[in-house]
C-alpha cells in the first residue's frame, strides 16, 4: 500500500482551478526526493506533466505548478484554465513514475451550469467591483430600467431608475443612465460579497416588448497563494487592491483559529506586539498599492495572510481582499546569528550580519528601524561607504568574514542606540534579518583617553588598555572613514596599569603618530578581533592644531542632525545615483558624509608585532 | 461557532445500504473540509472519507477500507453533506461522527479538526 495520500476524486468546471494536494511521510529521503505529476494513458505508462524539479509539459505551460511543502509532507499541484480535455485519471507520486510511491487521482472537468441563451458571464473576486451592461431598444429608453436577482423561480427587485435599491444592496449599488443615443444602461456594484453570486437579470420597459438580458454574476473567494520562506529570513506580500480603494486605509491581517483576522499592521499605526522591529507597511502607489515586509521569521508566523482596505483599518465583508498562506520552512539556509547583542554605554557592538552567499558582490546595507506609523528604515552605512552624518567616526560596514556573513560595528555607544536593526542587501531580499541591540549596565573592556589634540610637526602617543581576557585576540588600531577602517601599525608596549585586578596579561597597545600632520586629524579606533571576527572597539577623535599659536582652539567633531532627506528601506525597485539596486525602491535620495581623509594619510608609527592587515576595506 | 448534527444510523443487515447526513449550521462560510469519521467499540477512531471544496471545485478523500463502496456528497444550499455507505460489512459497525475543518491545508486523514457531531450509531448485522 503506497504511504502518498491525496483527493480520489477531484471535480472542477471548465475555466477554473485546482488546488491538489498530496500527502506523504515526511522521511529526509522523502522530502527531498522529486515530486510529480503524470497523467496516465491509454498504455498504462504515465506521462509527467509537471515535477518539483522544474519540468512542466507543454500542455501545462502557463497555468501549472507543483510546490513541495517538505516540513509538511505535502506537495501541491495548481492548474489553472481548465478544460474539458482535462477530464482523465492523473497520479500524483515520489520518486519515479513508474514505481509504487503514488497515488491515483480521478479529475472531472465539466461544462459550467447551463445558462439561458445570450447570458454574459462576469466572474470578479469578493470586494471589487462589477459593472453590468443591459442594453436596451429606443422605444424603451423613456420607461423604467430595472435589475433583478433570480433565486429559483422567483425574480428579487434589486435597482430601479425610480430610485428604488434593494436593503442589501444599500450604499453599494448604482444605476446608470447615458445621454440619448446611447441605448445601454449599467449597473455597478461596489464591494461585492459572495452572497451576491448568481443570476441577473437586466430589464428595459415592461410588456411583451420589453428587453432583457441575462447576467451570471460569479463572485470568487480569492485562492491563497503559496509562500515558503526560510525560518529567520524575509516575507513581502504584495498587495495591490485595485484604485477603487486607493484612499482607504490598508491592512494586513493573520486569520487565526476562529477564522476572524487579527491585525499585523495597518496605515492607521496599529501593529500587532509580536512583529515589533520586524514589520515594514511600505507608503502605497498611486494606484492603492502597497507592500509589508517581516523579517526574522519564526515557526509561529505561519499561517493564512489577508490584506484588504477599509476605513476601520480591519476585515469587514465585501471589500476587496488579497490572500497568502505562508508557510516557515525549518530547514533554513539562513544561517542563525545572535537575534540580541548587548553592550554597554560607551562600549561598542559588532553584529554579524548573513547575506546570501552566492551574492558575494551585492550591496550591504544596515538600518534603523523606527516604528512610528506604518514602521520605517533609514540607512545607516553601506558597503560603499555611505554613512549617516551622525554616526559619523563610530560605525562601520565591513565584508569580512564574508562568505555569506557582514560585519557592522558601533560604537561609543548610549542608551539612544538601543532598537531594531536590519541587515539587508540589494540582491535576495529573503535574507533581510532584524537584530536587536540592547544597552545593558557595565563599563567598556578598552580603555583610551578622551579627545586628543595633536600638535603639528610633534609626536603622539595613544594608548589603548585592554584586559586580560582579550590576551588571545588580535589587537589593532585603525583610521576610521566613510569607506571603513584602516588598520594602522602599533605597538603592544606591555603590561597596563589601567586594571588593577588583573595579572601582567592586562596589557595596551599603542598607536604612534610621528610626525603628525593635517591629515591625521580623524577619528581613531582601537580594538580587538580573531581572524576574520571582530570584538569590541574604542574611539578617539584627534584634533590636529599648530604648534603653540596664540588663539588656537579644539576642534570638535561636532554630532551632525540627521539628513532631512535619508534613505529609507522599503520593497520595490528604484535607481539611486546610477547604481541600479535590484529590489529596493529600496531607497529614497540621502546626503554622503564626506570622505574624511585619505585612510592612515600620514601616520608614520612604531612598528611591532602586532597585525597591519587591512580591515574591513576590502572584502578576503 | 459551528454545529454539527449526524443522522441516519441505525440497524442494517450485511451488504445492505444507508445514507447518513450531516447538517451544519453557525459559520458554516468558514467550513472548507468536512468528513467521516467512525469509532467501533474499544478502538481508536478512524478516518472514513471527508470532502474539501474552495470556489466550484471539490475534492472527495477515501480510506482504503471503504473505497468503492461508500460516496460522500455535499448540498451546498442546505449546508450538508451526506455519506451513502453501501455493500456495508459488519466491520463497518461503528459510532460515525461528522466534522468541519477550517484548513485547505491540513491532512483531512487527520483528527484535528476544528468541529465535531455527537455521532450516529450504524450497526451492521444479521
Known amino acids: 500500500k503506497s504511504p502518498v495520500f491525496g483527493p480520489q476524486e477531484v471535480s472542477s468546471v471548465e475555466g477554473n482551478s485546482v488546488s491538489i494536494k498530496c500527502y506523504y511521510p515526511p522521511t529526509s529521503v522523502n522530502r527531498h526526493t522529486r515530486k510529480y505529476w503524470c497523467r496516465k494513458g491509454a498504455s498504462g505508462r504515465c506521462i509527467t506533466l509537471v515535477s518539483s524539479e522544474g519540468y512542466v509539459s507543454s500542455n501545462y505551460a502557463g497555468r501549472a505548478n507543483l510546490t513541495n511543502f517538505p516540513e509538511n509532507g505535502t506537495f501541491v499541484v495548481n492548474i489553472a484554465q481548465l478544460s474539458r480535455d482535462d477530464s482523465g485519471h492523473y497520479k500524483c507520486g515520489l520518486g519515479i513514475n513508474s514505481r509504487g510511491l503514488s497515488f491515483d487521482v480521478s479529475l472531472e472537468v465539466s461544462q459550467g451550469p447551463e445558462l439561458p441563451n445570450g447570458t454574459e458571464v462576469y466572474t470578479v473576486d469578493v470586494g471589487r467591483t462589477v459593472t453590468i451592461k443591459c442594453p436596451f431598444k429606443t422605444e424603451n429608453a423613456p420607461k423604467t430600467k430595472a435589475l433583478y436577482k433570480k433565486i429559483g423561480q422567483t425574480s428579487v427587485l434589486v435597482i430601479d431608475s425610480r430610485n428604488y435599491v434593494n436593503p442589501n444592496y444599500k450604499d453599494r449599488i448604482r444605476l446608470r443612465i447615458p445621454g440619448t443615443g446611447q441605448l445601454i444602461f449599467t449597473v455597478v456594484i461596489d464591494r461585492l460579497r459572495l452572497s451576491d453570486h448568481g443570476l441577473y437579470l437586466c430589464q428595459a420597459g415592461d410588456g411583451s416588448n420589453r428587453d432583457e438580458k441575462n447576467a451570471d454574476l460569479q463572485v470568487l473567494e480569492p485562492e491563497p497563494e503559496l509562500v515558503y520562506e526560510d525560518l529567520r529570513g524575509s516575507v513581502t506580500f504584495h498587495c495591490a487592491l485595485g484604485l477603487e480603494v486607493a484612499n482607504v486605509a490598508k491592512f494586513l491581517c493573520r486569520v487565526n483559529s476562529r477564522e476572524t483576522c487579527d491585525v499585523v499592521i495597518n496605515t492607521l499605526g496599529k501593529r500587532d506586539s509580536a512583529f515589533e522591529g520586524r514589520i515594514l507597511l511600505n507608503p502605497q502607489d498611486k494606484d492603492g498599492s502597497f507592500s509589508v515586509v517581516i523579517t526574522g521569521l519564526r515557526k509561529e508566523d505561519e499561517g493564512r495572510y489577508l490584506c484588504g482596505a477599509h476605513s476601520d483599518g480591519q476585515l469587514q465583508e465585501g471589500w476587496p481582499i488579497q490572500a497568502w498562506q505562508l508557510f516557515v520552512n525549518e530547514e533554513s539556509t539562513i544561517p542563525r546569528s545572535p537575534t540580541v547583542v548587548k553592550g554597554v554605554a560607551g562600549g561598542s557592538v559588532a553584529v554579524l550580519c548573513p547575506y546570501n552567499p552566492k551574492e558575494s558582490q551585492s550591496l550591504k546595507y544596515w538600518c534603523l528601524w523606527e516604528g512610528a506609523q506604518n514602521g520605517r528604515c533609514p540607512l545607516l552605512v553601506e558597503s560603499q561607504g555611505l554613512v549617516q552624518e551622525q554616526y559619523e567616526g563610530r560605525l562601520s560596514l565591513l565584508q569580512e568574514p564574508g562568505n555569506g556573513t557582514f560585519t557592522v560595528i558601533l560604537n561609543q555607544l548610549t542608551t539612544q542606540d538601543a532598537g531594531f536593526y536590519w541587515c539587508l542587501t540589494n540582491g535576495d531580499t529573503r535574507w533581510r534579518t532584524t537584530v536587536e541591540i540592547k544597552i545593558i549596565e557595565g563599563e567598556p573592556n578598552l580603555k583610551v583617553p578622551g579627545n586628543v589634540t595633536a600638535v603639528l610637526g610633534e609626536t603622539l602617543n595613544i594608548p589603548c588598555h585592554f584586559p586580560c581576557k582579550f590576551s588571545s585576540y588580535e589587537k589593532y588600531w585603525c583610521k576610521w572613514s566613510n569607506t571603513g577602517c584602516q588598520t594602522l601599525p602599533s605597538q603592544d608596549e606591555g603590561p597596563s596599569e589601567a586594571f588593577v585586578n588583573c595579572d601582567e596579561n592586562s596589557r595596551l597597545v599603542s598607536l604612534t603618530l610621528n610626525p603628525v600632520t593635517r591629515a591625521d586629524e580623524g577619528w581613531y579606533w582601537c580594538g580587538v578581533k580573531q581572524g576574520h571576527f571582530y570584538g569590541e572597539t574604542a574611539a578617539v577623535y584627534v584634533a590636529v592644531e599648530e604648534k603653540k599659536v596664540a588663539g588656537s582652539r579644539y576642534v570638535s567633531p561636532a554630532k551632525a542632525d540627521a539628513a532631512p532627506d535619508e534613505k529609507v528601506l522599503d520593497s520595490g525597485v528604484r535607481e539611486i545615483e546610477n547604481k541600479a539596486i535590484q529590489d529596493p525602491r529600496l531607497f529614497a535620495e540621502e546626503k554622503v558624509v564626506a570622505d574624511t581623509g585619505d585612510q592612515a594619510g600620514g601616520s608614520r608609527a612604531s612598528v611591532d608585532s602586532s597585525s597591519s592587515e587591512e580591515q574591513g576595506g576590502s572584502s578576503k | 461557532q459551528v454545529q454539527l448534527v449526524e443522522s441516519g444510523g441505525g440497524l442494517v443487515q450485511p451488504g445492505g445500504s444507508l445514507r447518513l447526513s450531516c447538517a451544519a449550521s453557525g459559520r458554516t462560510s468558514s467550513i472548507s473540509t468536512m468528513g467521516w469519521f467512525r469509532q467501533a467499540p474499544g478502538k481508536e477512531r478512524e478516518f472514513v472519507t471527508a470532502i474539501r471544496w474552495s470556489g466550484s471545485s471539490s475534492y472527495k478523500y477515501y480510506a482504503d477500507s471503504v473505497k468503492g463502496r461508500f460516496t460522500i456528497s455535499r448540498d451546498n444550499a442546505r449546508n450538508t453533506v451526506y455519506l451513502q455507505m453501501n455493500s456495508l460489512k459488519p466491520e463497518d459497525t461503528a459510532v460515525y461522527y461528522c466534522?468541519?475543518?477550517?484548513?485547505?491545508?491540513?491532512?483531512?486523514?487527520?483528527?484535528?479538526?476544528?468541529?465535531w457531531g455527537q455521532g450516529t450509531l450504524v450497526t451492521v448485522s444479521s
Open positions: 466534522a468541519a475543518q477550517m484548513s485547505l491545508w491540513r491532512d483531512p486523514r487527520e483528527i484535528d479538526y476544528d468541529y
